[in-house]
């Protein structure tokens, strides 16, 4: 056959679907690779062809669109499973072509099983709710296009294994789940089961997402430097190791980039000649407030190093702060016999 623009296996689109549920999968060509949509392509006389490679096989084969009850079908640029089976797992290819043009892309489809509590190998989207922030909602994801607007589905919400029924601060409202006041205890996996009829059959869509309750923007503050501070002086003799921790607290801020860095005499450590190492550790609170610690270390400090200015800087979307460490050279302890005796007036 003539040359075909092959976009390869699009592993960025690792599609996971539950066994025994409907799945509608759009050909990625029109979403990510080509500059025109399916309608334009179809009008121009291009045909969309689907085929697949089973899991652990090399052989590409056509998709069987003549299964009982049209279990697998194609509608425009969408491949439909009504429903999926476990052995539908494999790499699927959609190819757009006519006599003069050809373009194709493959993508992996994994059909997964869920257990009695909706646990599965499915990668779960995370939805962040602000703590004690007033009413917030999550919406049952990825259910558009499965049934017409004339069909009224039944929606059931679960937290973990349990149907959400008479919960204090969580109220199912159709496709939405409302949190009256989000608390840490609301952390967990939430599942919506959407049930709808189609051609005398009943289908279920199961969607699970993780809710994480995070710090509220109402309580957010600029970075707070706990160390260095005015109460601790780093007194060292030449030759000793100098260790200065910079510990910074960052309030949780959605999509904020938290940064901590040291300057030595106003320069980044990389830009000066002294042998300095910096080790960073990060910890998070239950509401995803962040504490970053950067330890500045000079193995064998010189008297010159002890005269330098060591400043810790921190920045978030809420602002920028800096704090200098108090570093000084240790005065040698007096030798008792001579110096102390002189002090007492001995001759």
């Amino acid at each position: 056959s003539e040359r075909c623009d092959d976009w390869g296996l699009d592993t960025m689109r690792q599609i996971q679907v539950f066994e025994d549920e409907p799945a509608r999968i759009k050909c990625p060509l029109f979403e990510h690779f080509l500059k025109f949509n399916y309608s334009t392509a179809h009008s121009a006389g291009l045909t969309l062809i689907w085929y697949w490679t089973r899991q652990d096989r090399d052989l590409e084969e056509p998709i069987n669109f003549r299964l009982p009850e049209n279990r697998i079908s194609k509608e425009k640029d969408v491949l439909w499973f009504r429903p999926t089976l476990l052995n539908d797992t494999g790499n699927y290819t959609c190819m757009l072509r006519n006599t003069t043009y050809c373009s194709k892309v493959a993508f992996p489809l994994e059909v997964v099983q869920k257990d009695s509590c909706f646990n599965s190998p499915m990668k779960l989207p995370v939805h962040k709710l602000y703590i004690e922030y007033g009413i917030q909602r999550i919406t049952c994801p990825n259910v558009d296009g499965y049934f017409p607007s004339s069909v009224k589905p039944t929606i059931t919400w679960y937290m973990g294994c349990y149907k959400i029924q008479n919960f204090n601060n969580v109220i199912p409202e159709g496709m939405n789940l409302s949190f009256l006041i989000a608390l840490i205890s609301n952390n967990g996996n939430y599942t919506c089961v959407v049930t709808y009829p189609e051609n005398g059959r009943t289908f279920h869509l199961t969607r699970t997402l993780t809710v994480k309750v995070v710090g509220s923007p109402k309580n957010a503050v600029p970075p707070v430097i706990h160390s260095p501070n005015d109460h601790v002086v780093y007194e060292k003799e030449p030759g000793e190791e100098l260790l200065i921790p910079c510990t910074v607290y960052f309030s949780f801020l959605m999509d904020s980039r938290n940064e901590v860095w040291w300057t030595i005499d106003g320069k980044k450590p990389d830009d000066i000649t002294i042998d300095v190492t910096i080790n960073e550790s990060i910890s998070h609170s239950r509401t995803e407030d962040e504490t970053r610690t950067q330890i500045l270390s000079i193995k064998k400090v010189t008297s010159e190093d002890l005269k330098r200015s060591y400043v810790c800087h921190a920045r978030s979307a809420k602002g920028e702060v800096a704090k200098a460490a108090k570093v000084k050279q240790k005065v040698p302890a007096p030798r008792y016999t001579v110096e102390l005796a002189c002090g007492f007036g001995a001759t």
């Epitope: 009695s116 509590c117 039944t154 059931t156 679960y158 199912p172 049930t195």
Partner: antibody, heavy 119, light 107 residues
Framework: QVQLQQPGAELVRPGSSVKLSCKAS????????MDWVKQRPGQGLEWIGN????????HYNQKFKDKATLTVDKSSSTAYMQLSSLTSEDSAVYYC????????????WGQGTSVTVSS | DIQMTQSPSSLSASLGERVSLTCRAS??????LSWLQQKPDGTIKRLIY???TLDSGVPKRFSGSRSGSDYSLTISSLESEDFADYYC?????????FGGGTKLEIK
Amino acid sequence: QVQLQQPGAELVRPGSSVKLSCKASGYTFTSYWMDWVKQRPGQGLEWIGNIYPSDSKTHYNQKFKDKATLTVDKSSSTAYMQLSSLTSEDSAVYYCARDYYGSIGMDYWGQGTSVTVSS
Amino acid sequence: DIQMTQSPSSLSASLGERVSLTCRASQEISGYLSWLQQKPDGTIKRLIYAASTLDSGVPKRFSGSRSGSDYSLTISSLESEDFADYYCLQYASYPWTFGGGTKLEIK
């Protein structure tokens, strides 16, 4: 189409045990819970418990906790309920029915197995 | 356990008549209720789920509704095959519980 096949009748002795079967077809057995329901002659329906075939997780009505044991055989798409230490009170029709995570209740029912406990 | 009180326990009605059966839940069940029909041969068929959603293949003369903790099944015009026993089932929380049943007889 969805079918849940149960044997018509079982005659058993007092004090013995009986294992009732429910063979599922026409759907993916491991994707739905299987429930069991009791109906004494001329009486109403009582929910005994359910089991999820994929991982054998069970829920029991406390009333039947020591009476019924639910199991599955995934290879034959069959659910079982064992009733132990049988008495005349256990004489009833036992139904199996499937449900999807309790989201819409029990949608398909077996024909029921009539258990008679008699010496 | 949630108690489901079903009324009436028996009902005599004529062909073409409109009848209503009611179930009252002892606790909030949030619409997690279905109606079942049991024929004299013991066959059980679900008619309605989620309080008001008609199962596929069930005639439109059957309908379900909710008013607070009261749930109703209405048959708009009785046909001969409708004479049977009817049960409500709450599946809001375990253990699931049934109403005591209504025997619908031909007058």
